[in-house]
Interface confidence: low
């Protein structure tokens, strides 16, 4: 049995983490010569038959899951992987600290702690310079992010966000940056270990010229990679609740 039309890719430029009132472009990319694209916001009736959606100003109502597909002749492709568009700056920023401190010897241990005055049950940690966003919801269940056996790769600038599993696409503003310094080794900033590299798409003003307005309300963001966490009290093996979209 041969497969169907391959699924397109859907990306947010410059990132899928979008501060409120900032712009973002969603782009669906299929093979050359596609007859028709369909880009939709899941769990809603919003859709457009265009490959590109330019959002000049991000709103709460536009946060959520998006996906796209394309049509060639009478055939529809499989749907793209779903894109989670997150509105940031919805809540006040949390604080990020390092225990025992932000300077750590190579081979030592450090724990990054994200704290908020609100009753949020989800947290996301980002390392500046890494592609965004990366989530590993099954690895962490609390607002502490232990880094065991620190290496030079862990050096860099970190930020965290807090949010609620009830509204998983509405996040706080980012914390103030925390600079993690690894001593006793040559420092070569890189991605957090165990996370696969992925390309970072660059935003171009030319993108806007290709776009079509999707709605009057509309979505940029920080480029980085994240790890999400929920509090230690959570026993769910699924990690942070992912209120489906639909990926």
């Amino acid at each position: 049995q041969s497969g169907p039309l391959p699924k397109p890719s859907l990306q947010a430029l410059p990132s899928s983490l979008v501060p409120l009132e900032k712009p973002v472009t969603l782009r669906c990319q299929g093979p050359p010569g596609v007859d028709l694209y369909r880009l939709e916001k899941l769990s809603s009736s919003r859709y457009q038959d265009q490959a590109v959606l330019f959002i000049p100003a991000m709103k709460r109502s536009l946060a959520g899951r998006y996906r796209c597909s394309y049509q060639n002749g009478s055939l529809w492709s499989l749907p793209s992987d779903q894109l989670e568009l997150v509105a940031t700056g919805v809540f006040a920023k949390p604080s990020l600290s390092a225990q025992p401190g932000p300077a750590v010897s190579s081979g030592g241990d450090v724990t990054l702690q994200c704290q908020t005055r609100y009753g949020f049950d989800q947290f996301a940690l980002y390392k500046e310079g890494d592609p965004a966003p990366y989530k590993n919801p099954e690895r962490w269940y609390r607002a502490s992010f232990p880094i065991i056996t620190v290496t030079a790769a862990h050096s860099g600038t970190y930020r965290c966000y807090s949010f609620s599993s009830r509204d998983p696409y509405l996040w706080s503003a980012p914390s103030d940056p925390l600079e993690l310094v690894v001593t006793g080794t040559s420092v070569t900033p890189s991605r957090l270990p165990t996370e696969p590299p992925s390309p970072v798409a660059e935003f171009s003003e030319a993108t806007a010229e290709l776009t079509v307005s999707f709605t009057n309300e509309v979505f940029t963001t920080e480029t980085s990679r994240s790890i999400t966490a929920s509090p230690k009290e959570s026993d769910s093996p699924a990690g942070p609740a992912r209120q489906y979209y639909t990926k």
Epitope: Q1, W76, L78, P79
Partner: antibody, heavy 114, light 106 residues
Framework: QVQLQESGPGLVAPSQSLSITCTVS????????VNWVRQPPSRGLEWLGM???????DYQSTLKSRLSISKDNSKSQVFLKMNSLTTDDTARYYC????????WGQGTSVTVSS | DIQMTQSPSSLSASVGGRVTITCKAS??????IAWYQHKPGKGPSLLIH???TLQPGVPSRFSGSGSGRDYSFSISNLQPEDIATYYC????????FGGGTKLEIK
């Protein structure tokens, strides 16, 4: 050629945990998601959950509290773990590629019994 | 969660005949429905996705239609090898299978 192959324990005691591995070939887990589906004896298909290319997961709401799906991209393997098994979990378990599940494995039979 | 009500649960038809199976969703699924054929001892096979898009290699006597909450799947010129259980699947919001339809040949 796209292929998926499930491997499991066959027999599991009640209240114990179930672990099943889906080994795939012909496509990359970095880009494609994998679903888990089961079929109890003489009953229909039931979707359990999915792990996406980026590692994020979704679960059937009634099973979310005792289900965990993970993967190892480098080994082309996806893992299903289900806790607190009862005899109602006796079924044939399948893994299937992405949405809307265009390729399936042959399934592995799991019996929950003491 | 979205519920899918599939009917009938079983049906019998003659070779060369035509059968139709329906699935009703508990809410609008925006054409995100697929149909599968499942034979004993095998994994299910995808026949149709996105309501009416036929998988490559699937005979054109299989077809699908519908919109909103109501969808149907038909087999024309029924063949002996079509004996199987057929399932609908919605993939608009999480995934939910219909209860299945067991097809027998008279």
């Amino acid at each position: 050629q796209v292929q998926l192959q499930e491997s499991g324990p066959g027999l599991v005691a009640p209240s114990q945990s179930l672990s099943i591995t889906c080994t795939v070939s012909g496509f990359s887990l970095t880009y494609y998601g994998v679903n888990w589906v089961r079929q109890p004896p003489s009953r229909g298909l039931e979707w359990l959950g999915m792990i996406w290319g980026d590692g994020s997961t979704d679960y059937q709401s009634t099973l979310k509290s005792r289900l965990s799906i993970s993967k190892d991209n480098s080994k082309s393997q996806v893992f299903l773990k289900m806790n607190s098994l009862t005899t109602d979990d006796t079924a044939r378990y399948y893994c299937a590629r992405d949405l809307p599940m265009d390729y399936w494995g042959q399934g592995t039979s799991v019996t929950v019994s003491s | 969660d979205i519920q899918m009500t599939q009917s009938p649960s079983s049906l019998s038809a003659s070779v060369g005949g035509r059968v139709t199976i329906t699935c009703k969703a508990s809410q609008d699924i925006n054409k995100y429905i697929a149909w599968y054929q499942h034979k004993p001892g095998k994994g299910p096979s995808l026949l149709i996705h996105y309501t009416s898009t036929l998988q490559p290699g699937v005979p054109s006597r299989f077809s699908g239609s519908g919109s909103g909450r109501d969808y149907s799947f038909s087999i024309s010129n029924l063949q002996p090898e079509d004996i199987a259980t057929y399932y609908c699947l919605q993939y608009a919001l999480l995934l939910t299978f219909g209860g299945g339809t067991k097809l027998e040949i008279k």
